[in-house]
């Protein structure tokens, strides 16, 4: 007779969730000379320690930490990228600008990109069905406490300009409620950081507002002027010609705005 | 590959003020470019550092408030105006670009041939 299954809302663990992780990690670190002293059979087995046999609402920060410290890496404070709602740019951007650092540029993230996964109480089995929806089911599911943790180590790991991209064209340009709202700009380290530099990115051709001054990018600046650290913005009005331009800076067009 | 070639050191009195500049070649965009300095028996130490595209600036805390670091892209010149010099502002001061922080430890990748500036009391 098969065992009833608990129902989640959202889709279940990413198919070959085991295969991908260790092949990730295994490219990872083959393609990064600094992680190659990691153990990429001690970080899947510290990964599936952290959900396996737990209920999948019920997870903490605590249930990571020894991936956190198998994947303890370091990258230069002043390089680093966060963005919201907009990944893609920002991953395009830190291929070509190879040395600056989004959370996906690193070990652990970039193991869980675009992955889902969840276990069963008290059983060894992953879960492929469903996986709690975090509004939903639960906030306290493994996806979520996962990025949580990574994005706060990676925050409080930020100092001098912070870097982050946002996403012009959302009704919310800064939304209080995505990760880096809610998690990473309260663990900037006023004592580290001095500046958060963000940079917005206009969606429309002909888009020539000037969406520094939009009510949530002054949302922002409040928030963070409050951690007693600086606050400055820019206008991306045409990404693809940013991207041209970190590509090929000595172009003439690239003194312009851009 | 960047060049870096700074200018507008010298002698200057003690409450005097300075403006070094460095001209910079080759790739520019998006480089966090700093000034140095280095004193006489000392390690060269940071000073101050600005972001090349968003021109958002940071300094070391013995310069706040009287240093400050500027750059115009359009002559692709980094400045360093220096105000209320004190007699120990006296070092080697260096453009860098490239800048790197791992935790204390600041490097860059591209380095200047430095320009002397001397505050006499």
């Known amino acids: 007779v098969p065992r009833w299954r608990q129902q989640w809302s959202g889709p279940g663990t990413t198919k070959r969730f085991p295969e991908t992780v260790l092949a990730r990690c295994v490219k990872y670190t083959e393609i990064h000379p600094e992680m190659r002293h990691v153990d990429c059979q001690s970080v899947w087995d510290a990964f599936k320690g952290a959900f396996i046999s737990k209920h999948p609402c019920n997870i903490t920060e605590e249930d990571y930490q020894p991936l956190m410290k198998l994947g303890t890496q370091t990258v230069p404070c002043n390089k680093i990228l966060l963005w919201s709602r907009i990944k893609d740019l920002a991953h395009q951007f830190t291929q070509v600008q190879r040395d600056m650092f989004t959370l996906e540029d690193t070990l652990l993230g970039y193991l869980a990109d675009d992955l889902t996964w969840c276990g069963e109480f008290n059983t060894s089995k992953i879960n492929y069905q469903s996986c709690p929806d975090w509004r939903k089911d639960c906030s306290n599911n493994p996806v979520s406490v996962f990025w949580k943790t990574v994005s706060r180590r990676f925050a409080e790991a930020a100092c001098d300009v912070v870097h982050v991209m946002l996403n012009g064209s959302r009704s919310k340009i800064f939304d209080k409620n995505s990760t880096f709202g809610s998690v990473e700009v309260h663990n900037l380290q006023p004592e580290k950081v001095q500046t958060l530099e963000a940079w917005v990115i206009h969606g429309g051709r002909e888009d020539s507002r000037d969406l520094c001054q939009d009510p949530t990018i002054k949302e922002l600046e409040s928030i963070i002027s409050k951690r007693n650290i600086q606050f400055s913005c820019k206008n991306i009005y045409r990404p693809d010609k940013f991207l041209q331009c970190v590509k090929n800076p000595e172009d003439s067009s690239c003194t312009s705005e851009i | 590959q960047v060049q870096l070639q700074e200018s507008g050191g010298g002698l200057v009195q003690a409450g005097g003020s300075v403006r070094l500049s460095c001209a910079i070649s080759?790739?520019?965009?998006?480089?966090?470019m700093g000034w140095f300095r280095q004193a006489p028996g000392k390690e060269r130490e940071f000073q101050a550092g600005?972001?090349?595209?968003?021109?958002?600036?940071y300094y070391a805390d013995s310069v706040k408030g009287r240093f400050t670091i500027s750059r115009d892209n359009t002559k692709n010149t980094l400045y360093l105006q220096m105000n209320s010099l004190k007699p120990e502002d006296t070092a080697i001061y260096y453009c860098?670009?490239?800048?790197?922080?791992?935790?204390?430890?600041?490097?860059?990748?591209?380095w200047g041939q430095g320009t002397q500036v001397t505050v006499s009391s």
């Open positions: 860098a670009a490239g800048l790197k922080r791992i935790g204390d430890q600041r490097e860059a990748d591209y």
């Open positions: 080759g790739r520019t965009f998006i480089n966090d």
């Open positions: 600005i972001t090349w595209f968003g021109g958002s600036t």
